[in-house]
Every structure is written in structure tokens, then in C-alpha cells.
């Protein structure tokens, strides 16, 4: 089944998708649609590359990472509910039924408004999920210590930070990866 | 591998109370909605109502409104639905779904629980 | 509480025709609408989510189209294990289902 992806209202969010390229440059076409991958295509695509650019791309989402170097991930920006759903990412190798497919689920939770605590020095507590990923393998949580009193606005910027960078490295390991060549 | 175990067939007389279980397996119950929804035969599909295991919310139609009640335990991964006052109209099959996330559509459903009100 | 109706309680069709399904909403509910196929015996599956996304595993030949309060759910080509009951849902509001249409092939 596809794998797993989640973000809260409001927030960015991240599906990883990633091939590498036979050679620096030589760069293989991609479609992100919405709906799992039909046969051929992309159905309701989003965003699309050829061989040397992003030629199309619908607003709110865009790729965030290198996608010459084959980081095809995709950002989906201020997500709402309607986010929610199956997602394509098709890697478009020339070639008759070369087409790697990969269908991820994003699952958009809402914010629930909560009263503030007064202290919050356990972050994983405050947002138990919003930082795990769910890949291949076991879960992989990244944890926030403990750091100084600050209000829920910079929890909420911080986690969303760590989302855009260090998580992205992490996902690279359990996203869709594939080698071309 | 998702899957929503529901349990077994009931009879009871009209106007006594039933509570029906749902044991899910390969997910956990605290990531999602999860729904009850009833069929009568030739009535189609009627939602009963849902619950956030994760705390507690939960959310009746109308019709059922103090008269059913979903609530779940997240520690055996399970979810309930309490009916009460029970008619021969509430005699159907009754099914556990999981939300695909927070959307109100489903997908996954566990077998159906048979419930018969008869005297 | 929103209504959908579907109007035809039977098709009948043949293998390899194409037929389409349609649900109607008593109220704008967008396009958060989702169709459910229920064969004998067996409890519903989810085939389109939001009108028109198909959801995983679900063959190319189900399409499903329309936004406001008019809904159409397509099969391209009809196959003989396509026989079953198809539900229209919303999930605009508290969700609602249409009563059913029995696909039969002839």
C-alpha cells in the first residue's frame, strides 16, 4: 500500500519523491498529479518537469530540494483539509512501461484549538505526530529536547522548520528512490 | 495490513441496549477518525456517528443523537458503538470504517456486525 | 442534513459498454463527494474520493466528475466483476449517502 505522510492545517507539507540521475544534468521528466497513478500519466497533475525545468506548476505547490540532482519532493504550501488524498509521483524513464510510480497518502490533520499550557518544555508531548514520519521502516520521530520557554506561534514556526530542513534529509531514507542508469 | 476485526452476530429484544466492538490491527486508532455505519437491508448506507480516539470527540447524526454512543480504547486499539432502546428498525448490519484521515470518507470498512432486534 | 439522490436504483449494461452513475446533492457540498462499490456479500469499497480522485488500487476505467450538486460516476468499460451496488457519499458536512444503484450486467 502506499506510504503514509502528515501535516496539520496551516502547515507546509512534505512527500518525498527522489531518482538519480544517470549523469549530472541528464534529467528525466516527472509528474505530480492528485489521485493514485493511473497506467499512463498523471491524472489531475500539479506539477510537472521535463528534461531541463519545472514547465508547470499549479500554486501552493512547488519543489523545495534540488531537482537536478533528482529531488523531486514536493511542498505543498498552508495546507487545508481538502489537501488531504493520494498523490502521483511518476518518474517518466523513456521507454515503453519504464514509468516508476509511486502513490503517497497525505493525511492533513486539523488544528484543534487547545488552551495554551503555561509552561511547555516536552515538545513531542504538544505535538506528538506532527514531527513523525512514516517511511519503509519503523517510524522515525525527531525529538526536540528541552528548550527554553517560548509561546506556542514560534512551537508551531520551529516545527515547521525542522519539517522544510532536517526532516527532509530523514526522508530521503524512506521516500520513493530510484536509480536511473 | 489494515484491518478493522468487528464482533460477532447479535439477537436482542426490543428496547434492551447492545454495545458492538471493533478491533483494529496495522494502524493505530489515535491517527484517525474512526465511523460506524449501519445498513438495513434494501435501505442502503446510513452513517451513525464518529470518534477521535485520539480525545474523545465525537460527532452523531441527527437521527441517532442520545441514542447511540461511539467511544474507544486506545490502549487495545478498539472502538464501541452503544446502542440503545432498541427497535425492530435498528435490525441491520453494522460496519466499522476508518476514516482516510480527518475527511468523512472511508477507507477501510471491517466486516459488519448482524444485529437483530426480535422478540 | 444533505440529501443524495440517486435516481436510478438499476442499470443494466453490458460487458465493455460504458455506463455512468449519477447522485445528486440537495445543497452545494463542492466536491467532496465519494463513491463506495458494495458487491454481494462483501462490505463497501472506496473507489473515488473528492468527485474525482481515484483512490489506490482502483483501475483507470472508474472516473468520477462534477462539482456543486450534480455527480456522475463513470465506468469506461464495463467488466463482468463490476457487478455490485455503487454508493454516492458527501463528506461536505455530516456525511450522507445516496441509496444505491444496482449495476447489472446483462
Known amino acids: 500500500s502506499e506510504v503514509e505522510y502528515r501535516a496539520e492545517v496551516g502547515q507546509n507539507a512534505y512527500l518525498p519523491c527522489f531518482y538519480t540521475p544517470a549523469a549530472p544534468g541528464n534529467l528525466v521528466p516527472v509528474c505530480w498529479g492528485k489521485g493514485a497513478c493511473p497506467v499512463f500519466e498523471c491524472g489531475n497533475v500539479v506539477l510537472r518537469t521535463d528534461e531541463r525545468d519545472v514547465n508547470y506548476w499549479t500554486s501552493r505547490y512547488w519543489l523545495n530540494g534540488d531537482f537536478r540532482k533528482g529531488d523531486v519532493s514536493l511542498t505543498i504550501e498552508n495546507v487545508t483539509l481538502a489537501d488531504s488524498g493520494i498523490y502521483c509521483c511518476r518518474i517518466q524513464i523513456p521507454g515503453i512501461m519504464n514509468d516508476e510510480k509511486f502513490n503517497l497518502k497525505l493525511v492533513i490533520k486539523p488544528a484543534k484549538v487547545t488552551p495554551a499550557p503555561t509552561r511547555q518544555r516536552d515538545f513531542t508531548a504538544a505535538f506528538p505526530r506532527m514531527l513523525t514520519t512514516r517511511g519503509h521502516g519503523p517510524a522515525e520521530t525527531q525529538t526536540l529536547g528541552s528548550l527554553p520557554d517560548i509561546n506556542l506561534t514560534q512551537i508551531s514556526t520551529l516545527a515547521n522548520e525542522l519539517r522544510d530542513s532536517r526532516l527532509a534529509n530523514d526522508l530521503r531514507d524512506s521516500g520513493a528512490t530510484i536509480r536511473i542508469g | 495490513e489494515v484491518q478493522l476485526q468487528q464482533s460477532g452476530a447479535e439477537v436482542v429484544r426490543p428496547g434492551a441496549s447492545v454495545k458492538l466492538s471493533c478491533t483494529s490491527s496495522g494502524f493505530n486508532i489515535k491517527d484517525y477518525y474512526l465511523h460506524w455505519v449501519m445498513q438495513r437491508t434494501e435501505h442502503g448506507l446510513n452513517w451513525i456517528g464518529r470518534i477521535d480516539p485520539d480525545d474523545a470527540e465525537t460527532k452523531y447524526a441527527p437521527q441517532f443523537q442520545g441514542r447511540a454512543t461511539i467511544t474507544a480504547d486506545t490502549s487495545s486499539n478498539t472502538a464501541y458503538l452503544q446502542l440503545s432502546s432498541l427497535t425492530s428498525e435498528d435490525t441491520a448490519v453494522y460496519y466499522c470504517?476508518?476514516?482516510?484521515?480527518?475527511?468523512?470518507?472511508?477507507?477501510?470498512w471491517g466486516q459488519g456486525t448482524t444485529l437483530t432486534v426480535s422478540s | 442534513d444533505i440529501v443524495m439522490t440517486q435516481s436510478h436504483k438499476f442499470m443494466s449494461t453490458s460487458v465493455r459498454d460504458r455506463v455512468s452513475i449519477t447522485c445528486k446533492a440537495s445543497q452545494d457540498v463542492s466536491t467532496a463527494v465519494a463513491w463506495y462499490q458494495q458487491k454481494p456479500g462483501q462490505s463497501p469499497k472506496l473507489l473515488i474520493y473528492?468527485?474525482?480522485y481515484r483512490y489506490t488500487g482502483v483501475p483507470d476505467r472508474f472516473t468520477g466528475s462534477g462539482s456543486g450538486t450534480d455527480f456522475t460516476f463513470t465506468i469506461s468499460s464495463v467488466q463482468a466483476e463490476d457487478l455490485a451496488v455503487y454508493y454516492c457519499?458527501?463528506?461536505?458536512?455530516?456525511?450522507?449517502f445516496g441509496g444505491g444503484t444496482k449495476l447489472e450486467i446483462q
Open positions: 473528492s468527485a474525482s
Open positions: 457519499q458527501q463528506h461536505y458536512s455530516t456525511p450522507t
Open positions: 470504517t476508518r476514516d482516510f484521515g480527518y475527511t468523512d470518507y472511508f477507507d477501510y
